[in-house]
Interface confidence: medium
Amino acid sequence: PEPPTACREKQYLINSQCCSLCQPGQKLVSDCTEFTETECLPCGESEFLDTWNRETRCHQHKYCDPNLGLRVQQKGTSETDTICTCEEGLHCTSESCESCVPHRSCLPGFGVKQIATGVSDTICEPCPVGFFSNVSSAFEKCRPWTSCETKDLVVQQAGTNKTDVVCGPQDRQREQKLISEEDLGGEQKLISEEDLHHHHHH
């Protein structure tokens, strides 16, 4: 018969003949002949092959080097490679996780949106209006400003993205301020402390 030009799935062409590939976890020892099957051998300890193959050598399992901050997340088998991840407080520098770097802290004015994992760094977000963070932290979210009203107090100092509001006692004379006619171009008006803060921020 005519020698094949292509072989079926899980076969390979050699010497005008289709031979079976070795299954995952095994390496090729010798090709098949007209009279014998492909000869395969299991990979040794700490070795693997993860596909149907005709490799004569198995691959070494990845080494999770503790000096690089790595640890084993999933132990390798004869068919799978070892999966490394980073130790606590560290995350991978790349998708293949060949080394680790310490997590980043979020600076004041920023809060933690997502806490770092073994494979991703801390994700920080700016504190929106009404929230603040006064610390450099890899764990703390932005915190809401204190609500002075719920404590029967008034805002003495406005909050920022880095500082909380400062509350103070109610004081009729401080709470209401008379804006003179000159200041308002001939128009006299009574303004509350809250209006002043609103005016200051816009």
């Epitope: 606590e88 407080g89 310490p102 802290s105 450099s136 932290s137």
Partner: antibody, heavy 122, light 108 residues
Amino acid sequence: EVQLVESGGGLVQPGGSLRLSCAASGFTFSSYAMNWVRQAPGKGLEWVSIISGTIGKTYYADSVKGRFTISRDNSKNTLYLQMNSLRGEDTAVYYCAKDTERDITGSPFDYWGQGTLVTVSS
Amino acid sequence: DIQMTQSPSSLSASVGDRVTITCRASQSISSYLNWYQQKPGKAPKLLIYAASSLQSGVPSRFSGSGSGTDFTLTISSLQPEDFATYYCQQSYSTPPITFGQGTRLEIK
């Protein structure tokens, strides 16, 4: 009140060993990374080593790598620095310093001990 | 490793003066810069963290600014207790954690 008290310093010959301790109080010791920082006489500050709070991951300055070992006993609220193969250039005041975070995140040192003097001389 | 360079290395000033100390990083460190004060025979004390945030209990005459590679520590009106040595420290690329060589502030 946070307190860090170092001990174990003294005079040691070149090639000798010494173990420094830092007793911590006033905070949840296991929740914070801890550092050793040293200062040679009349010189600036040099960071020596850090150990993270929970799993005790360690890092060292190149100048002490392989000779010094940082460790902690969270049950005793104590930080240690085992110093072997000491050299003249290791002569310094050694401070323990508390990190503001539990992991090695790039955070400042908010509390320091008073320091303990290590003199390496024959 | 990131190198930190402070200037000047020493400085003479009088009570009431406004004083500025600078710190330069060998590469960008964003705002991961801390300032410490150290008095003779004493441990360092954290003054400013994250380039511009004042540590709790530190007088408001101390302020910090800058980002990237150039940073400054300013004392708006020197007090007698401010005469000390000041160190900058980067905590961006850690470890190793690196300090500047220090700036000694003396009475004129």
